[in-house]
């Protein structure tokens, strides 16, 4: 699938600019193409690295340009290499001095195994010296000085693959830089044969195409295309699909084209000579002008295309009548396709005449793998090839090429495939809450591995050992209803991205168990302080109809420090628990439930303070109001948390002894007012108020002073003083 072309312009080096251009036509290499010196062919050449640049006129091309440098830097053998599926395709060529003593008849020569071969060099300088011929740098033959002919030849009566190599000729007094080079290519097989055992017949390659001994395909000369190289390109174009163009003012003049072995090098159609700068004489056409026109009806002979057939005629000599051939065209293939990884069935559709057959349609992956159709059908106007990729993966992303190669020509259409990784959640869904018949799930679709966008989500669930069910979900929080109590369930999430086969692999599985239908909480719950560090929780005895063992779970936590939480399991036959190791003067919350294998229902929350470790603070907001002649209303507030058990109101008449006071003890700390009664009218009292807890009494800072009102006049007929 790699169409690699090396243009050597020019192979004979003088003091003019010279170049090598390597083109990967219609092929998008993963690895860059390289141009280098071919030391295998010629050891003693310049060692300097080549200055390889991108050919800006083409997308996939590299170039080396020598601008009138000393010719010793240029003389030698070169290669262009492209790699596909780890295999290298290497094209070789050579450059030599125009002033060499001999010049080769051709830059390369391709022969079949067993051919009778003459490798020839033309003498261009006459010297009184022996002529010597080398193969791959080793001496093979010499001609005494008086016998050096005008055409120096190496004769191989029965060429074998081991005869292949670079042959060079020079006078004995010369050196590498006065040597002429030619490369002999010997096909592994005899003429018209290919295959590992050379027993398969080659397609007849027209127009000097060469049958590849490993594939049986024709390597077409520059200027021809198609399965048999019968189709001529438009003038000045080349490449397997004739898409490349010679940019020179005279087309492909002075371009020597080198193609993969066993083709070797030749001029483009219409040109000949070592420098490809001589036009074909009339009646000749093709690469190196080696083909002759024998047009049946005396049609015009074009040096680029051969016989120009009139309407209704075709064939190399216009000898066939019938419907004219039409170069295949690829139809309805988008430039870009986004594909989900997994099974993929790309389709190639082509028109043309004759209609392409199944064998003539291929699909080339970015790594160079060539796929043959799995299924094929055609209508009157189109051939449709369906290919199967059992498992397409992201590394398969890149430029794929649909290729159609018929006798009527060849066409390739590249298109970009972007293979997406199916999304998969990284985490299992989280079970937020469960009951005996429901579960609240956070499906945790983010983060996920793979490619978005996420089109939809499915939550799969099932009781263990049963089949999966799923629900389509939109939100992250989902409630599953109608579950079975006391059942093990499995959950996982599948993410779906757009496109066919967009369902990702389900993510990790979460297991959970639904609750049993639970018992009610203990009755008669009471929470009371026991000490500064303990509270006592009590409840009524528990009787259940179930035979399952049960226990009371008590959960307590501090209102101040929420983190201080503890769960205590209490055997079911007990009716109290001492919650100890608590902090003094701290309020705790407690709740309880009765659990079997299933968890019971929680009780309401109870709160209590542990006993204080300090004296209580004075009651606050002390007010004495509603004073009459013998009553007064005392009110106050107390601060929570000091285990205040009682409030003491102490009052005495002003001026009386300290011990003549009256104490009123209010044992219910929730009471916040008290009416003093039996006071004397028009009397001043000192009133103190204390809070009392397990440590002692508070210290009042000052006494309140009140004066009762005068007694009301007796209007009931008593004596009146005037």
């Amino acid at each position: 699938a790699m169409d690699l072309i090396l243009i050597n312009s020019l192979p004979l080096v003088s003091d003019a600019e010279t170049s090598l251009t390597c083109i990967a036509s219609g092929w998008h290499p993963h690895e860059p193409i390289t141009i280098g010196r071919d030391f295998e062919a010629l050891m003693n050449q310049h060692q300097d690295p080549l200055e390889v640049t991108q050919d800006v006129t083409r997308e996939w091309a590299k170039k080396v340009v020598w601008k009138r440098e000393k010719a010793s830097k240029i003389n030698g053998a070169y290669f262009c290499e492209g790699r596909v599926r780890g295999q290298a395709i290497r094209i070789r060529t050579m450059k030599m001095r125009q002033q060499a003593s001999f010049l080769p008849a051709t830059l390369t020569m391709t022969v079949d195994r067993g051919d009778n071969v003459n490798i020839s060099f033309k003498k261009v300088l006459i010297k009184e010296e022996d002529a010597v011929i080398y193969k791959n740098g080793s001496f093979i033959h010499s001609v005494p000085r008086h016998e050096v002919p005008d055409i120096l030849e190496v004769h191989l009566p029965h060429a074998q693959p081991q005869d292949a190599g670079v042959y060079s000729a020079r006078y004995i007094g010369g050196n590498l830089f006065t040597s002429a080079f030619t490369r002999l290519i010997v096909r592994r097989c005899e003429a018209q044969k290919w295959g590992p055992d050379c027993n398969r017949p080659c397609t007849t390659c027209k127009n000097n195409g060469v049958c590849h001994e490993d594939t049986g395909e024709c390597i077409c000369p520059p200027g021809f295309m198609g399965r048999t190289c019968e189709k001529a390109c438009e003038p000045h174009t080349f490449g397997r699909t004739c898409k490349e163009r010679c940019s020179g003012s005279e087309g492909c003049k002075s371009y020597v084209f080198c193609l993969p072995d066993p083709y070797g090098c030749s001029c483009a159609t219409g040109w000949r000579g070592l420098q490809c700068n001589e036009a074909c004489p009339y009646g000749h056409y093709g690469p190196d002008c080696k083909l002759r026109c024998h047009c049946t009806n005396e049609e015009m002979c074009d040096r680029f295309q051969g016989c120009l057939c009139s309407q209704g005629w075709q064939g190399l000599q216009c000898e066939k009548e019938g419907r004219p051939r039409m170069t295949p065209q690829i139809e309805d293939l988008p430039d870009h396709i986004e594909v989900n990884s997994g099974k993929f069935n790309p389709i190639c559709k082509a028109s043309g005449w004759p209609l392409p057959t199944s064998e003539e349609m291929t699909l080339v992956k970015p790594d160079g793998t060539v796929l043959q159709p799995n299924d094929f059908n055609h209508t009157d106007h189109f051939s449709v090839a369906i290919f199967t990729v059992n498992r397409i993966l992201p590394p398969d992303s890149g430029v794929w090429v649909c290729s159609v190669n018929t006798v009527a020509g060849m066409v390739e259409k590249p298109f970009n495939i972007s293979v997406k990784v199916l999304p998969e959640p990284l985490h299992a869904p989280n079970v937020i809450d469960t009951g005996h018949n429901f579960a609240i799930i956070n499906i945790s679709s983010e983060p996920y591995f793979g490619d978005g966008p996420i089109k939809s989500k499915k939550l799969f669930y099932k009781p263990v050992n049963q089949a999966w069910k799923y629900i389509q979900v939109m939100n992250e929080i989902v409630t599953l209803n109608y579950l079975e109590p006391r059942t093990d369930y499995e959950l996982c999430v599948q993410l779906v991205r757009p496109g066919e086969g967009g369902e990702g692999h389900p993510g990790p599985v979460r297991r959970f168990t639904t609750a049993s239908i639970g018992l009610p909480p203990p009755r008669g719950l009471s929470l009371l302080p026991k000490s500064q560090t303990a509270l006592n929780l009590t409840w009524q005895p528990i009787f259940t109809s179930s035979e399952d063992e049960f226990y009371v779970e008590v959960e307590r936590w501090s209102q101040q420090t929420r983190s201080d939480q503890q769960n205590i399991k209490v055997p079911g036959n007990l009716t109290s628990v001492l919650l100890n190791n608590l902090l003094p003067r701290e309020q705790y919350s407690v709740r309880a439930r009765v659990n079997t294998k299933a968890q019971g229902e929680w009780s309401e929350e109870l709160r209590a303070w542990t006993l204080s470790d300090i004296l209580p603070p004075q009651p606050e907001n002390i007010k004495i109001t509603n004073i009459t002649d013998y009553t007064a209303l005392v009110s106050w507030t107390i601060v929570d948390g000091y285990s205040i058990s009682s409030i003491i109101i102490r009052y005495k008449v002003q001026g009386k002894n300290e011990d003549q006071h009256i104490d009123v003890k209010i044992k219910n700390a929730t009471i916040t007012q008290y009416q003093l009664k039996g006071l004397e009218p028009e009397t001043t009292y000192h009133v103190d108020i204390f809070a009392e807890n397990n440590i002692g009494s508070s210290n009042p800072a000052f006494s309140q002073e009140i004066r009762t009102l005068p007694a009301p006049k007796d209007l009931g007929g008593g004596k009146m003083l005037l």
Partner: antibody, heavy 122, light 112 residues
Framework: EVQLVESGGGLVQPGGSLRLSCAAS????????MHWVRQAPGKGLEWVAG????????VYADSVKGRFTISRDNSKNTLYLQMNSLRAEDTAVYYC???????????????WGQGTLVTVSS | DIQMTQSPSSLSASVGDRVTITCRSS???????????LDWYQQKPGKAPKLLIY???NRASGVPSRFSGSGSGTDFTLTISSVQPEDFATYYC?????????FGQGTKVEIK
């Protein structure tokens, strides 16, 4: 006109150093291997060192190995011989010579310079 | 190292004489192909040497045809078929089969 011109010779004390140069003209310098050959007064020729066209291959006579260094600058068309730790027996006329080959094989020296005299004496 | 021995070390000849100089090597100079890795040089007093013959028998460019080289293996000969006045000089053989390249000690051809 094809020619080689040596320079840099002279009188030097034993243990001293000297650098000889050979300027080439009239031919494509970097097409050929180059050599230094010396001749002690009244004696025969002795090959000293050779260097291939691209400096890829360099060889020395045992008598100078480790003391002399041959090099070339193709951009300047010049051959050099750096001579260190000179001894009295290094006294000679030093010729630079062009090979007909590009490598150090099948050598033949078809162009010679006029020579430069190096005298090592205290 | 390959030792090169020339004989005679000197000789006298008259103009027109045929002169033969012999060079013997301590090992064969014949390469795997048919060429011998031996060169002949001529040196005149106060001048640089001049290449006469390379690879045993190939005359260098501009060298008169009266000079010829022959021999193979270890025994080589330089022949001047008819010596001329300008040919009176010292002649050296040099082996190029392996480094170090080594010269013969020279043969001085003088006018009788």
């Amino acid at each position: 006109e094809v020619q080689l011109v040596e320079s840099g010779g002279g009188l030097v004390q034993p243990g001293g150093s000297l650098r000889l140069s050979c300027a080439a003209s009239g031919f494509t310098f970097d097409d050929y291997a180059m050599h230094w050959v010396r001749q002690a007064p009244g004696k025969g020729l002795e090959w000293v060192a050779g260097i291939s066209w691209n400096s890829g291959s360099i060889v020395y006579a045992d008598s100078v190995k480790g003391r002399f260094t041959i090099s070339r600058d193709n951009s300047k068309n010049t051959l050099y011989l750096q001579m260190n730790s000179l001894r009295a027996e290094d006294t000679a006329v030093y010729y630079c010579a062009k090979d007909i080959r590009e490598q150090l094989v099948e050598d033949a020296f078809d162009i010679w310079g006029q020579g430069t005299l190096v005298t090592v004496s205290s | 190292d390959i030792q090169m021995t020339q004989s005679p070390s000197s000789l006298s000849a008259s103009v027109g004489d045929r002169v033969t100089i012999t060079c013997r090597s301590s090992q064969s100079l014949l390469h795997s192909h048919r060429y011998n890795y031996l060169d002949w040089y001529q040196q005149k007093p106060g001048k640089a040497p001049k290449l006469l013959i390379y690879l045993g028998s190939n005359r260098a460019s501009g060298v008169p045809s009266r000079f010829s080289g022959s021999g193979s293996g270890t025994d080589f000969t330089l022949t001047i078929s008819s010596v001329q006045p300008e040919d009176f000089a010292t002649y050296y053989c040099m082996q190029t089969l392996q480094t170090p390249l080594t010269f013969g000690q020279g043969t001085k051809v003088e006018i009788k």
